[in-house]
């Protein structure tokens, strides 16, 4: 049964398809494969803390250690990547904090940002100084393990020199890598000594070896690619938002809710209200009013602006976000001060009512 009563005839669904919103990432913890990772649950006053990964309960095992408010992952692998949450259960409510873990190699993100500097990798030699191939920029080759989300672009580089100028070819799992070996083929940029694969899929996993050779010698370097698959997830709200606020009577105030969602998020701003002098209906459920929701006629739904506030505007404001997978919500309190008191930004905490997640 629903755990609140809506005041007036306010629908919980948008009447028209909502517009897409700027989305914000939750905090991301990055580790290289093989490293250990420690994350502290950023929630206060937790009687009991439970952990989940991608919505599934997380228990201790030989690599995962749960001690109090700390989660430790030993010898991280790409399979440890995902959406984590810690939930603090208290006597009256519970609160959840989300974060991402990405066990990956940052330089395989696929951006061509460093291709502009590729010219220095193409070293021209004095024609008299014959020389076997050699690496010119080993820094760009240090990380051999690349864990990349599916659909991303991957770039492997083997900057080299030699005289005469060496040629470069690529092997996959020790065999000649042909264009027809993957959907969409791949690009080789000889000027930048790079192999580029767009929109990687699980079948792209494997060892990629660049072989650089001329008549005086041959060198090679192997990268390992792991493709991390994604799963759809419910909305994530940035921790600490909306933030508690205070203002004087007649002042203006803004609450902000930062949303991260793969799918179309439906954002609602809800406030506890009174009806006939009561905050609760006959069923014992609180009266709530939808102040704003995302839709065609709504401007940036991530922001709730209140103008010329009165004492009646004081109270708890809930940012509730849903998509087809599920919901998330966080709330903040507005304190309205008499005119003679100066307003101040309060400590940024979130409070979750017990009938919302």
């Amino acid at each position: 049964r629903p755990s609140f009563s809506l005041v007036e005839d306010t629908t919980l669904e948008p009447e028209e398809p909502p517009t897409k919103y700027q989305i914000s990432q939750p905090e991301v913890y990055v580790a290289a494969p093989g490293e250990s990772l420690e994350v502290r649950c950023l929630l206060k006053d937790a009687a009991v803390i439970s952990w989940t990964k991608d919505g599934v309960h997380l228990g201790p095992n030989n690599r995962t250690v749960l001690i109090g408010e700390y989660l430790q992952i030993k010898g991280a692998t790409p399979r440890d990547s995902g959406l984590y949450a810690c939930t603090a259960s208290r006597t009256v409510d519970s609160e959840t904090w989300y974060f991402m873990v990405n066990v990956t190699d940052a330089i395989s993100s696929g951006d061509d940002e460093d291709d502009t500097d590729g010219a220095e990798d193409f070293v021209s030699e004095n024609s008299n100084n014959k020389r076997a191939p050699y690496w010119t920029n080993t820094e760009k080759m240090e990380k051999r393990l690349h864990a990349v989300p599916a659909a991303n672009t991957v770039k492997f580089r083997c900057p080299a020199g030699g005289n005469p100028m060496p040629t470069m070819r690529w092997l996959k799992n020790g065999k000649e890598f042909k264009q027809e070996h993957r959907i969409g083929g791949y690009k080789v940029r000889n000027q930048h000594w790079s192999l580029i694969m767009e929109s990687v899929v699980p079948s792209d996993k494997g060892n990629y070896t660049c072989v650089v050779e001329n008549e005086y010698g041959s060198i090679n370097h192997t990268y390992h690619l792991d493709v991390v698959e994604r799963s759809p997830h419910r909305p994530i709200l940035q921790a600490g938002l909306p933030a508690n606020a205070s203002t004087v009577v007649g002042g203006d105030v803004e609450f902000v809710c930062k949303v991260y969602s793969d799918a179309q998020p439906h954002i609602q701003w809800i406030k506890h209200v009174e009806k006939n002098g009561s905050k609760y209906g006959p069923d014992g459920l609180p009266y709530l009013k939808v102040l704003k929701h995302s839709g065609i006629n709504s401007s940036n739904a991530e922001v709730l602006a209140l103008f010329n506030v009165t004492e009646a505007d004081a109270g708890e404001y809930i940012c509730k976000v849903s998509n087809y997978i599920g919901q998330a919500n966080q709330s903040a309190w507005l304190t309205v001060l008499p005119k003679q008191q100066a307003p101040g930004r309060e400590k940024e905490i979130t409070a979750s009512p017990d009938y919302l997640e």
Partner: antibody, heavy 114, light 107 residues
């Protein structure tokens, strides 16, 4: 592993009601919507509605509003879909699915016949 | 409600063929579309979500693309086990509507 197990097949008379259950396991029941989808014999898929078990928020296809009632019991991790005023056209397989539509129940055949 | 118009309603192809199914939404839905495979007597199986993301464990021969109102689902090299009915579904706004389905058969 994630599982959604539905109740067994039902044969109902026109005008009566049917209540189909969907027991979830292997994931946090309150963290995902539960959707209900139906498929008439030889026909396509039709979304009936969904519920967010944590707070009971439900959403319905207007074609079923007033006839379909979706509920959830957090204590048993079970979702229910009740369809009233049954008619022969309601003969179909009824599926529950987790919020991401990645996991589905095995389906419950409801036959409406006089 | 957003209507999803799927075509063709049926198609016959040979093993190894490239197969393409299209879905057109009556309103813009950004990339909020999923593709499912359903075999007789079984529940649908999620293949693609958010237009182009392959769900975990789905073979790489299945892919999706498109944005706004026009979407495409492709099987790069048809396998015998791919014989099934395929559905698109928009998950942008309720009610979450499905296409009419495409029945895929082997020549």
């Amino acid at each position: 592993q994630v599982q959604l197990v539905q109740s067994g097949a039902e044969v109902k008379k026109p005008g009566s009601s049917v209540k189909v259950s969907c027991k979830a396991s292997g994931y946090i029941f309150t963290s995902y919507n539960v959707h209900w989808v139906r498929q008439a014999p030889g026909q396509g898929l039709e979304w009936i509605g969904s519920i967010y078990p944590d707070n009971g928020d439900s959403s319905y296809n207007q074609n079923y509003k007033g006839r379909a009632t979706i509920t959830a019991d957090k204590s048993t991790s079970t979702a229910y879909m009740e369809l009233s005023s049954l008619r022969s056209e309601d003969t179909a397989v009824y599926y529950c699915a987790r919020g991401d539509f990645a996991y589905w129940g095995q389906g419950t055949l409801v036959t409406v016949s006089s | 409600d957003i209507q999803m118009t799927q075509s063709p309603s049926s198609l016959s192809a040979s093993v190894g063929d490239r197969v393409t199914i299209t879905c057109k939404a009556s309103n813009g839905i950004s990339n909020d579309i999923a593709w499912y495979q359903q075999k007789p007597g079984k529940a649908p199986k999620l293949l693609i979500y958010s237009a182009s993301y392959r769900y975990s464990g789905v073979p790489s021969r299945f892919s999706g693309s498109g944005s706004g109102t026009d979407f495409t689902f492709t099987i790069s090299s048809l396998q015998p086990e791919d014989i099934a009915t395929y559905y698109c579904q928009q998950h942008s706004t309720t009610p979450y509507t499905f296409g009419q389905g495409t029945k895929l058969e082997i020549k």
